[in-house]
């Protein structure tokens, strides 16, 4: 969490951003909140990016003002206009790309004063893994697949029964570059699996951590997966 203040105490407002991550090929949100004002027409929101000459986005007098917008962001940005009055200056970014990563500044002017806060925005790819029993294999084998990751993640297997066990000797992980030549498909195979046990395939890079669980019994197979973004620090 980054909390920024205006320069002079009497004319400063608190602006708060949260470091976040964008999944390339999706819309992303850069979070920013501020002390609200009672009049929308008195609020100015400016988003800037380090190393970019033009503005990322500007909203003032109750509407978008995009005449100074940098070409890199043309047609891609929006604030949530109906939420500005309650102090939400978050930015929506369409079709996030790797090049959108960097340091952004959320700069706010209201009738109470000015304030700003920086935000570190990371971009990459992350997806939910799916763990299945590989019936084609000669022994009981699990196959963990996740379609899109970047940067290259680590893959670790764990088991409920053998907690703390190191499965690196009985697993094999491969990374296959996807057709757009950025993201990669992750495939990890775990051998010598025992029945009546829950196995977890954990995929992690510096942006996200995802886990796929599978419980194999004589009568059924249960699956569960979840994904968590890392480094969501507020400023």
């Amino acid at each position: 969490l980054i909390i920024g203040f205006g320069i002079s105490g009497r004319h400063s407002i608190t602006v708060t951003t949260v470091a976040s991550a964008g999944n390339i090929g999706e819309d992303g949100i850069l979070s920013c909140t501020f002390e609200p004002d009672i009049k929308l027409s008195d609020i100015v929101i400016q988003w800037l990016k380090e190393g970019v000459l033009g503005l990322v986005h500007e909203f003032k007098e109750g509407k978008d003002e995009l005449s100074e917008q940098d070409e890199m962001f043309r047609g891609r940005t929006a604030v949530f206009a109906d939420q500005v009055i309650v102090g939400n200056a978050s930015l929506r970014l369409k079709n996030v790309q790797l090049t959108d990563a960097g340091t952004y500044k959320c700069y706010i002017i209201t009738s109470k004063g000015k304030g700003n806060a920086n935000l570190e925005y990371k971009t990459g790819a992350f997806s939910m893994p799916e763990v299945n029993v590989d019936y084609n294999a000669s022994s009981e084998t699990l196959r963990c697949e996740a379609p899109r990751w970047f940067p290259q993640p680590t893959v670790v297997w764990a088991s409920q029964v053998d907690q703390g066990a190191n499965f690196s000797e009985v697993s094999n992980t491969s990374f296959e570059l996807n057709s757009e030549n950025v993201t990669m498909k992750v495939v990890s195979v775990l051998y010598n699996v025992t029945i009546n046990n829950t196995y977890s395939c954990m995929i992690e890079n510096d942006i996200a951590k995802a886990t796929g669980d599978i419980k194999v019994t004589e009568s059924e197979i249960k699956r569960r997966s979840h994904l968590q973004l890392l480094n969501s620090k507020a400023s």
Partner: antibody
């Protein structure tokens, strides 16, 4: 040259299925938001479905559960699988690339007629 | 659900005249996500304006877009014979993800 070419349209009975294809050239489908948009005879444009660069999909309520958008990255091709077709699905179906600057590339359209 | 209402439904003008087409949204739309398209009979739509006011590649400067919030305008400063067509506004980002207006038919008077 940046281009989209649709195929797969035709006459189909109510309740039937059809798969539309849209072959892209000059750009990579998986880096863009790719859409299907339709136009019923004498009517306006109606958005049908999108597949994001990430592979996630969304669709209009009118086709959810019946139509599925997908892509084959190796063939650089977009698809629309249409099941449980109804008379009101009769339209010209366009595929369109939504680049950063709006739907800037459109195919020529393929006609789907649902009739008994 | 965002509804885009275009007016007038039909606009009858002569070549050389100025055309003003309106697009009103039922709730606020980001200027970045508002586009205008032209469609001629038997043809696919063509992107004219994106980001409410930026001309797409190859679009003549007689076409201009303006507006913000809920009110957007497409202006054709001097009508050429090839400009007579149907025009659609479109928004991105709300539910449904993409919405088109019902269209304005620009016809020769």
């Amino acid at each position: 040259e940046v281009q989209l070419v649709e195929s797969g349209g035709g006459l189909i009975q109510p309740g039937g299925s059809l798969r539309l294809s849209c072959a892209a050239s000059g750009f990579i489908v998986s880096r863009n938001y790719m859409n299907w948009v339709r136009q019923a005879p004498g009517k306006g444009l109606e958005w049908v479905s999108v597949i994001y660069g990430s592979g996630r999909t969304d669709a209009a309520d009118s086709v959810k559960g019946r139509f599925t958008i997908s892509r084959d990255n190796s063939k650089n091709t977009l698809y629309l699988q249409m099941n449980s077709l109804r008379a009101e699905d009769t339209a010209v179906y366009y595929c369109a690339r939504d680049g950063d600057y709006g739907m800037d590339v459109w195919g020529q359209g393929t006609t789907v007629t649902v009739s008994s | 659900e965002i509804v885009l209402t275009q007016s007038p439904g039909t606009l009858s003008l002569s070549p050389g005249e100025r055309a003003t087409l309106s697009c009103r949204a039922s709730q606020s739309v980001s200027s970045s996500y508002l586009a205008w398209y032209q469609q001629k009979p038997g043809q696919a739509p063509r992107l004219l304006i994106y980001g409410a006011s930026s001309r797409a590649t190859g679009i003549p400067d007689r076409f201009s877009g303006s507006g913000s919030g809920t009110d957007f305008t497409l202006t054709i400063s001097r009508l050429e014979p090839e400009d007579f067509a149907v025009y659609y506004c479109q928004q991105y980002g709300s539910s449904p993800l993409y919405t088109f207006g019902q269209g304005t038919k620009l016809e020769i008077k």
